[in-house]
């Protein structure tokens, strides 16, 4: 019989008492085969974290700073359930730490030195740890003691709870630095008042502070937010302009064997019986003998944290950077205007080898990081382990939802001004063998299908989006008799045709021979009835252009396109017979790396781009033996995006809507995790 007990960790007598009451009340409402609670008492949250890591307890609820401690080795805990605030219809699990300024003050984030600052309190998240952590490497040396460095950075501050004797500048704007509401500039509202009164130039608070203090929109319009990219935005655009997005209060558990499903089952049932306004006898979110015992009194319920989400992703790059800076206190030798090497994310061995070759030839400008899937790469770029990669439009969508931005687009047509002219896109097509003459767009049911990969544009999002509109369900593996769609569940019929050996079967990388455009076409040649690819795929792999044994004798004339009106056309008539126009592949990065990635890639393509005439004697960025490694092989250049610099603008309304419609069919665990952070 599996043990269905969750050992909850309590950090005080009062918490232990509430925990026992929680245990007893759960017993009375949950059947004997359901989850149960046991209580473990420890002296502190850090002791609880250690106890969970050592398998002496299973769960505890923590503030963001402690979630960071819990994630660090050797603890390796992960977030499993989040408390939410507000309503069930619009649950808030995060708040945003922001820097508020008056509209008429003309400075940006990188010009804060010498300004006057208002903080909620020393050591508090939004008011101190996050802003000072992010500014840490700009502080004058020596950076220890921190208070002295901060005092020397700003021209005056109000940082309640600071030592006014040792650091008088930190109390210059609020004499005495009182650590309670007796100090008019204490806390969120106090720090905002410090700005409003004109005492300070910037207030470090949370996004809701300004709304709680200024009910009138006209009054709010006198203020702006400072963004990390050295721009400003209106105060209601905090989701796109903040210092960090911070989880409010989170249940953590072990990463391996952590009982996360059981913990969720327990808390979900607990909120049903003892949540807000559920029971008089016992209330989960109430603390008669104290404050915020086990859970925050202000919580309204729980949400399950998506399983793909580790602590780094949950806390977010900015928060982790801020806290790491404060804890580790390490900065580059001397901050220079020079760009650090760009860490390129490479998929599997083939891409890594090409990336390493690029790295050697780039003379230190490019470094390489490996991952097994595109989603793993996106996650690495999000958390700073990698910086950039080039992505198909379907993954540009996922990356965009995860906060990354497109920075350059692949262009596939030769033109005089390639780098300045991003193209409209390429065509997604459905290819069949000419010999299968009865096959049309209208009778594909039961046929064998070949896809570049799940989640990619031409191979999946466009054809499956069109198919979904027709069949109104997501069971594509039942629509086709079998197929190869790398990235599908291994037991799906859409992995049956794949050719990868062992664990590589149906993997969405080059270890699966039927992966990508060339792979999907090969799947059609060898096993399938229809391949969903780009309009250039057939000509690029026929007429001797691909020397591989399976392709070298293929003839373009032996293949035709399926048109949406039920007719068929020759391959060269793609402009009048395609499924949709697809946005070109694009390079994505984090917002903070945008300028450097842009600069270094422009340099790199001038050295190794299509101006290189002899690829047998020189490194060529846009060529690869096993097809489309790092970039599409037909890339002519990487083009500026001009104003199409967000994923929505880059992909276009129509494509974003199409992928959005297909979201209900999505199996992307990363997309689920990212939409948890930003619904």
């Amino acid at each position: 019989v599996p043990d269905k007990t969750v050992r909850w960790c309590a950090v005080s007598e009062h918490e232990a008492t509430k925990c026992q009451s929680f245990r007893d009340h759960m017993k009375s409402v949950i059947p004997s085969d359901g989850p149960s609670v046991a209580c473990v008492k420890k002296a502190s949250y850090l002791d609880c974290i250690r106890a969970i890591a050592a398998n002496e307890a299973d769960a505890v609820t923590l503030d963001a700073g402690l979630v960071y401690d819990a994630y660090l080795a050797p603890n390796n805990l992960k977030p499993v359930v989040a408390e939410f605030y507000g309503s069930k219809e619009d649950p808030q699990t995060f708040y945003y730490a922001v820097a508020v300024v008056k509209k008429d003050s003309g400075f940006q984030m990188n010009q804060l030195r010498g300004k006057k600052s208002c903080h909620t309190g020393l050591g508090r998240s939004a008011g101190w740890n996050i802003p000072i952590g992010l500014l840490y490497c700009d502080l004058p040396e020596p950076r220890k003691p921190l208070e002295k460095a901060v005092a020397n950075f700003f021209s005056g501050s109000c940082a309640p709870c600071a030592d006014g004797t040792d650091f008088p500048q930190l109390c210059q704007l609020c004499p005495g630095c009182g650590c309670s509401t007796l100090n008019q500039y204490f806390g969120y509202s106090g720090a905002f008042k410090c700005l409003k009164d004109g005492a300070g130039d910037v207030a470090f608070v949370k996004h809701s502070t300004i709304f709680e203090n200024l009910a009138n929109k006209a009054d709010r319009d006198q203020y702006e937010l400072l963004c990390l990219d050295n721009t400003r935005k209106p105060v209601d655009e905090y989701k796109d302009c903040h210092l960090a997005q911070v989880p409010s209060h989170t249940v953590v558990a072990r990463s391996m064997g952590g009982k996360e499903d059981l913990i969720w089952e327990l808390l979900n049932q607990a909120q049903e019986h003892f949540g807000k306004d559920k029971s008089k006898e016992f209330q989960l979110f109430s603390s008669p003998h104290g404050k915020d015992l086990l859970f925050k009194d202000s919580a309204h319920g729980f949400l399950k944290v998506p399983p793909r989400m580790d602590a780094k992703m949950y806390l977010g790059y900015e928060y982790v950077t801020a806290i790491r800076n404060l804890r580790e206190g390490t900065c580059p030798e001397a901050p220079t205007d020079e760009c650090k090497p760009v860490k390129w994310c490479a998929l599997s061995h083939h891409e890594r080898l090409k990336c390493d070759e690029w790295s050697v030839n780039s003379v230190g400008k490019i470094e390489c990081v490996s991952a097994e899937t595109t989603e793993d790469c996106i996650a690495k770029i999000m958390n700073g382990e990698a910086d950039a990669m080039s992505l198909d439009g379907g993954f540009v969508y996922i990356a965009g939802k995860c906060g990354l931005v497109p920075v350059l687009a692949e262009n596939y047509n030769k033109s005089d001004n390639c780098e300045d002219t991003p193209e409209a896109g390429y065509f997604a097509i459905a290819v069949v063998k000419k010999s299968a003459s009865d096959l049309t767009w209208d009778n594909l049911k039961g046929k064998k299908s070949c896809h570049t990969a799940v989640g990619r544009t031409a191979g999946w999002n466009i054809p499956m989006g069109l198919l979904y509109n027709k069949i109104n369900h997501c069971r594509f593996d039942e629509f086709f008799s079998e197929g190869c769609a790398p990235g599908s569940k291994k037991d799906s019929s859409l992995c049956k045709l794949c050719m990868g050996s062992g664990l590589n079967l149906c993997e969405p990388n080059n270890k699966e021979g039927y992966y990508g455009y060339t792979g999907a076409f090969r799947c059609l040649v060898e096993k399938g009835d229809v391949a969903f690819v780009k309009h250039q795929t057939v000509p690029q792999n026929t007429g001797g252009k691909n020397p591989d044994p399976w392709a070298k004798n293929l003839n373009e004339k032996d293949y035709e396109l399926l048109c949406l009106d039920g007719t068929r056309k020759p391959v060269e008539e793609y402009a009048n017979c395609h499924l949709a126009r697809a946005p070109n592949h694009a390079v994505v990065t984090r917002k903070d790396k945008e300028a450097c990635v842009h600069k270094i890639l422009r340099q790199q393509q001038h050295l190794f781009g299509s101006n290189v005439t002899d690829c047998s004697g020189n490194f060529c960025l846009f060529r690869s033996e096993t097809k489309d490694l790092l970039f599409r092989d037909d890339t002519v250049c990487l083009a500026k995006l001009h104003d199409r610099n967000t994923y929505e603008k880059y992909l276009g309304e129509e494509y974003v809507k199409a992928v959005g419609n297909l979201r209900k069919c999505s199996t992307s665990s990363l997309l689920e995790a990212c939409t948890f952070r930003r619904p």
């Epitope: 390493d356 790295s359 050697v360 030839n361 003379v363 230190g364």
Partner: nanobody
Framework: QVQLVESGGGLVQPGGSLRLSCVAS????????VIWYRQAPGKQRELVAL???????NYRESVKGRFTISRDDAKNTVWLQMNALEPEDTGVYYC??????FGQGTQVTVSS
């Protein structure tokens, strides 16, 4: 001007071993890494192995576990130890570092 000279090639039976060396004249050799390539008759030149300045190495899939690349900066030399040689390993082997043209290469023939 740095020049690269490859040596150590020869005729060897399948299963045999060879050790290729790449010696550079001049200073600053291999500061950004060194790559061994090979070219079989009528085929494209292909990357075999590389070693970066920090000692990181990588290999094409077909030679992994059989070939080992190493370096001795004091001697301005990079080696390619090739074991369990197969007929498909036949070709001219070249070493390369950024900014330096290809040398003459050294011929490796694996045949019984």
């Amino acid at each position: 001007q740095v020049q690269l000279v490859e040596s150590g090639g020869g005729l060897v039976q399948p299963g045999g071993s060879l050790r290729l060396s790449c010696v550079a004249s001049g200073s600053g050799f291999g500061i950004n890494g060194v790559i061994w390539y090979r070219q079989a008759p009528g085929k494209q030149r292909e990357l075999v192995a590389l070693i970066k300045s920090d000692g990181y190495t990588n290999y094409r899939e077909s030679v992994k576990g059989r070939f080992t690349i190493s370096r001795d900066d004091a001697k301005n030399t990079v080696w390619l130890q090739m074991n369990a040689l197969e007929p498909e390993d036949t070709g001219v082997y070249y070493c390369k570092t950024p900014g330096v043209p290809f040398g003459q290469g050294t011929q490796v023939t694996v045949s019984s």
